[in-house]
């Protein structure tokens, strides 16, 4: 199976677009969008903190941490109306992230 | 990183049996965790997976027959309703993408009158 | 459902020869295919994940290939110690799946 110029190969993913808005002090705001190729039951999301293809039920029940979206060693928790989660870092330092 | 099997004892059928997974190293909620059985000669069969939520996915021969829970520190593996077909060593793995990079040593389940 | 059917079940090789062993998908399983080595009394080993991929700390005569639905493990100048059971398993999707295995002898 040859893949043509362009092409992902199933189940992977690919960064199209990085924007960071680093303007409000003490916070970088980034939008990322990605091109994926997710194989049937899968869906475009995020893990360890790179896009990848997940169990598309994920997204529809909005149980973003059961894509591990956080690097190993940071805890994964629910934004309180299910918008998105945050990763917290050992250290106590915390990123959130919201899904549009 | 490490993970470790224990309850593995000799049954009589029909009496419920809970095996438990404990990691060493690492946080199960960083990682989809699995049960695996292997039949003495035989070779591997998986039981099913636990997400962080709680959310669990079986083999279709498996549904009904084993319930897979965890707690913040343990993941475990009941078998319902053993018969001597459930005879074997159960491994615990666990998984990102799919594909198994860490087991446990495995624990000897034995179903006999 | 997926089902892996794993050739030969078994094979004889000599030290420093060329084992190959198969294993066939029933369906494209889109290289989502891993290799495991296990020892008598021991758990599996991860050797090989997305087909070719091999694993930190294993040997590289281990090596893997294939597409759609066949996939080949090969262990090129075999040693004593690669005298096991090597199971190929797809996760393409659930539930996942072995194959039977290959029991690999060494003379």
């Known amino acids: 199976q040859f893949l043509k110029e362009g092409q992902l190969a199933a189940g992977t993913c690919e960064i199209v677009t990085l924007d960071r808005d680093s303007s409000q002090p003490r916070r970088t705001i980034a939008r990322q969008t990605a091109r994926c190729a997710c194989r049937k039951g899968q869906i475009a999301g995020t893990t360890r903190n790179k896009p990848s293809c997940v169990d598309a039920r994920i997204i529809k029940t909005k149980q973003w941490c059961d894509m591990l979206p956080c690097l190993e060693g940071e805890g994964c928790d629910l934004l309180i109306n299910r918008s998105g989660w945050t990763c917290t870092q050992p250290g106590g330092r915390i990123k959130t992230t919201t899904v549009s | 990183q490490s993970l470790e099997e224990s309850g593995g004892r000799l049954v009589t059928p029909g009496t419920p049996l809970t095996l438990t997974c404990t990691a060493s190293g690492f946080s199960l909620s960083s990682y989809y965790m699995n049960w695996v059985r292997q039949a003495p000669g035989k070779g591997l069969e998986w039981i099913g997976i636990i997400y962080p939520s709680g959310t669990t996915y079986y083999a279709g021969w498996a549904k009904g027959r084993f319930t897979i829970s965890k707690t913040s520190t343990t993941v475990d593996l009941k078998i319902t309703s053993p018969t001597s077909e459930d005879t074997a060593t159960y491994f615990c793995?666990?998984?990102?993408?799919?594909?198994?990079?860490?087991w446990g040593p495995g624990t000897l389940v034995t179903v006999s009158l | 459902e997926l089902d892996l059917t794993q050739t030969p079940p078994s094979l004889s090789a000599s030290v420093g020869g060329t084992v190959t062993i198969n294993c066939l998908a029933s369906e494209d399983i889109y290289s989502a295919l891993a290799w495991y080595q296990q020892k008598p009394g021991k758990p599996p080993t991860l050797l090989i994940s997305g087909t070719s991929n091999l694993e930190s700390g294993v040997p590289p005569r281990f090596s893997g290939s294939g597409s759609g639905t066949d996939y080949t493990l090969t262990i090129g100048g075999v040693q004593a110690e690669d005298a096991a059971t090597y199971f190929c398993?797809?996760?393409?999707?659930?539930?996942?799946?072995f194959g039977a295995g290959t029991n690999v002898e060494i003379k």
């Open positions: 793995a666990r998984t990102v993408s799919g594909y198994f990079d860490i």
């Open positions: 398993q797809g996760y393409s999707s659930y539930p996942l799946t």
